[in-house]
């Protein structure tokens, strides 16, 4: 299926040009999306191109500038947040990135009623996290690992926690491993729906081993960065959850929420918190061996001022074939009765589907079913449930939005997006206003992305929010590669692949092949999305064929494929890439003497193992910031898929699955190894150990390090990286510069 046909005709050939590397590095062909910042059922805020904060009323079609760019600029604000009572706006400046989600910033509070900044009891700086209560204008913030509360922005703060300490105790914010591998947020505090209570997590990292690496900077002596970072099998953070009454915070103080007995009996994690009402909260817990998850619904006991979590309100989710959930354990979406909920988990056939839980998980009512997967529940209203899935036309790499009418019996299902812009749009997400009165659809491709606004009752399109007209015009004279998404059936396994072909692709000719791989558990690379990136350039200008293959371990095609890699990382992911390459060779247009593979992070691990597979298929390859041994990576992620690196558990496979163990096999390939020295995620240690093993085996290889760069290799390093990799590949494929 050709998704993005090249617009080349003989008459046009002279005016059309190929993509250049410069186009990619300059972001010439980047696209915009439009996510409304909903503030009611029919109003949203948006930051205009000239940096005004504009309020839109959908029903009247009117727009209002509520905060001028002048005010924003006066404090160099890069972000804002309107209080729910619309009295105040916080302005965020001095953004300073920490890890993937976390950053610190300076916050100013602007009073909309008098058009002045709030003076007196100003916020300290830098703040680690700040948010408004869901109602009114209370503020909760985290400063120096402690949580503070303000009843009004101008009031003095009330200090909730006192034990916060850098790298030791974290209150209201996650430590490194919880941020990256469990919560995927910069915060660990949650307001109750009406702002009566504030729940928060406390992470104790006192006993966690520390990763230390040099940050060279430009001083005479490098700094040492220390991060409590539990690697596989190491001591983990100890987590506790507390709830405080924000109306009378000093009355009884924070109350701890009890951990379910079956969880507390051994090492465990807290995985998420969902408020149901002001006096009912739902916590999710996970055993360290991550195949058992417990959802616990707790109620406020007014008489004791405590939180009670009866065993009858504990729901257990267990996997017998792999780990619990997909990448994370899914979170519940509660219905209006405030006790029953909707949740995605595996059905009896091993496909992730929406279930309705009223009393017990055993009695769950399955809402969706089929050999496809429900991916996200967006919103549940009185009469509708909105979700996304990859059901339509049996393409796992698509996402469409569906509505199930839960108010009628039997419930009826409607695909909201399937036929809207069928050729252009096959991969959607959505953003809903209060009560799902309106929603925005954001289409990511395969055509040029487009964001639209819709009526939540009729699904009618109201207006286009962003259609990327400038991008469309800019691409008019570009020879884009062709893209096709197809599947291979091999030994009862379906391998979906995306192939990116040069604009004048001719099946009778031979082309060099580059495999781009990620391949991590519960990932998906073959998606119907738009992208003009490095591999687009390699196909357009350099005449390469690029392929992406989703093998065993990847997501949204059922548990059989997903859990195939359980306790055995580094085996089937590699096998499936190799199998696909052999099939591509059989297609007749691949030059089998010019095949390369590259990947980043988990993809760097897979590409390294593929190069060292001894098949002789690959001439060369690149690993960027690869994992080299699972003993070096984070406990929460690694143990989910590999168990523990102990003799009585899975130490043997931990040892067998390292890149270093295969050092000898790199002798007959050209290998480029790349890593940032300040990678907090996949530590430089991983590449240092590969390099050491290759040197010890007297195997020649190429390497590049990026000083003081993290896992993302951003800024000028990006340009250097892609230029360097381009030269390497062109040399490998004997392409002239």
């Amino acid at each position: 299926i050709v998704l993005r046909p090249s617009r080349v005709h003989n008459s046009e050939e002279n005016t059309m040009r190929a993509l250049t590397l410069k186009d990619i590095l300059n972001g010439t062909f980047s696209y915009k999306t439009f996510f409304p910042n909903w503030i009611s059922g029919q109003e949203y805020l948006h930051q205009s191109a000239d940096n005004n904060i504009v309020l839109y009323n959908i029903e009247t079609g009117q727009s209002y500038t509520i905060l001028s760019n002048r005010t924003m600029k006066s404090v160099n604000a890069s972000n804002y947040g309107l209080s729910p009572d619309r009295q105040f706006v916080y302005l965020e400046s001095d953004y300073s990135k920490l890890w993937r989600y976390s950053y610190t910033a300076t916050y100013y509070i602007y009073d909309l009623s008098n058009g002045e900044f709030v003076r007196g009891n100003e916020l300290p700086r830098p703040i680690q996290y700040l948010c408004w209560s869901p109602v009114g204008s209370k503020l909760a913030y985290v400063y120096q690992n402690n949580i503070y509360l303000k009843q009004r922005p101008g009031d003095p703060p009330f200090q909730i926690t006192f034990n916060g300490r850098e790298n030791k105790i974290f209150n209201g914010i996650p430590d490194w491993v919880y941020e990256e591998e469990m919560l995927a947020t910069k915060y660990a505090l949650w307001w109750s729906p009406n702002g009566k209570f504030l729940a928060y997590a406390e992470f104790n990292d006192t006993d966690i081993p520390v990763i230390a690496y040099s940050y060279y900077g430009d001083e005479q002596y490098p700094r040492t960065i220390n991060i409590p970072y539990p690697k596989a099998g190491a001591k983990n953070p100890v987590v506790r959850i507390f709830i405080i009454d924000t109306t009378y915070p000093a009355y009884v103080g924070p109350q701890e929420v009890p951990v379910p007995a079956m969880i507390a009996s051994s090492d465990y994690y807290f995985s998420w918190l969902t408020w149901v009402t002001d006096e009912r909260v739902c916590l999710q817990w996970l055993k360290r061996v991550q195949n058992v998850s417990v959802l616990s619904i707790c109620d406020f006991r007014e008489d004791w001022q405590t939180w009670d979590c009866p065993k009858t309100q504990e729901h257990i989710e267990e996997s017998r074939t792999g780990w619990a959930g997909g990448f994370f354990v899914s979170t519940p979406v509660f219905s209006y009765d405030a006790i029953s909920y909707y949740k995605i988990f595996s059905d009896k056939d091993g496909y992730k589907h929406i279930h309705y839980i009223k009393d017990t998980v055993e009695n769950a009512i399955q809402i969706t079913s089929g050999k496809w997967e429900a991916i996200n529940i967006f919103r549940v209203t009185q009469d509708s449930l909105f979700y996304s899935s990859n059901e339509f036309e049996e393409y796992p790499g698509r996402r469409n939005i569906y509505r199930i009418s839960i108010g009628s019996y039997p419930p009826s299902k409607k695909c909201v997006t399937c036929h809207l812009r069928k050729e252009r749009c096959q991969y959607y997400t959505a953003s809903f206003s209060d009560y799902a009165k309106y929603y925005a659809l954001v289409c990511y491709g395969p055509g040029i992305p487009i964001s639209t606004l819709h009526d939540g009752r009729t699904d009618q399109e109201i207006k286009i929010l962003e259609e990327n007209k400038e991008l469309e015009n800019a691409l008019k004279n570009i020879q884009l590669p062709k893209e096709e998404i197809k599947k291979l059936e091999v030994d009862e396994i379906t391998l979906w692949y995306k192939m990116i072909l040069p604009p004048q692709f001719d099946r009778s000719k031979k082309y060099p092949l580059l495999i781009q791989v990620y391949g991590g558990p519960c990932s998906q690379s073959v998606r119907s999305v738009f992208a003009v990136n490095w591999i687009s350039y390699l196909a357009s200008k350099e005449g390469m064929v690029i392929a992406l293959v989703d093998g065993r371990g990847t997501a949204f095609q059922g548990d059989k494929l997903l859990y195939a890699v359980y306790r055995k990382l580094g085996v089937y992911e590699v096998e499936d890439q190799i199998t696909a390459v052999r099939k591509f060779i059989e297609m007749g247009f691949i030059d089998e003497k010019r095949i390369a593979i590259w990947g980043w992070s988990y993809g760097g691990y897979v590409s390294s193992l593929a190069l060292a597979s001894g098949t002789g298929l690959f001439k060369c390859g690149i690993a960027v910031a690869p994992v080299s041994s699972w003993e070096y990576y984070a406990s929460v992620y690694t143990e989910r898929f590999m168990g523990l690196p102990t003799k009585d558990d899975n130490l043997e496979h931990y040892k067998n699955s390292t890149v270093m163990a295969r050092a000898e096999y790199f002798r007959n390939v050209d290998y480029l190894l790349i890593h940032g020295t300040a990678d907090d995620n996949v530590h430089f240690q991983n590449s240092a150990q590969i390099a050491k093993a290759l040197v010890n085996a007297q195997v020649d290889f190429q390497a590049m390090w990026y000083s003081d760069q993290n896992h993302g290799l951003s800024g000028l390093s990006t340009n250097h990286l892609y230029t360097h990799m381009t030269h390497f590949l062109k040399q490998c494929f004997s392409l002239s510069d």
Epitope: L55, N57, T60, L82, Q87, D111, N114
Partner: nanobody, 123 residues
Amino acid sequence: QVQLQESGGGLVEAEGSLRLSCIASGRTFGTYAMGWFRQAPGKERELVAAISTGGSTYYADSVKGRFTISRDNARNTVYLQTNSLKPEDTAVYYCAARRGSAYYTNHVDWPYWGQGTQVTVSS
């Protein structure tokens, strides 16, 4: 509780001006945010301009630069000066009040209303 009474509407030619007034009863006028809404036949009631207790103002983009809202707390009055009027400004103009923030654009969020005054702009 506050009662509102508008005045100053009428028939005016395009590019003309009108000054609408809204007088409020009660001694706590200064504690209310005030707004001017309008409703044309068959259309939603829409916010034109609003002014907070502290005097901050904001406007619908369609009237920005042409209309000015102001308040006189001593006189319990809010004004809407309308200049460079266009035929599409023709509507019934309503004065509204609410406790708290002025930054609400849905008419349902404003509990107190006047009876309205007709503004007709001829071309």
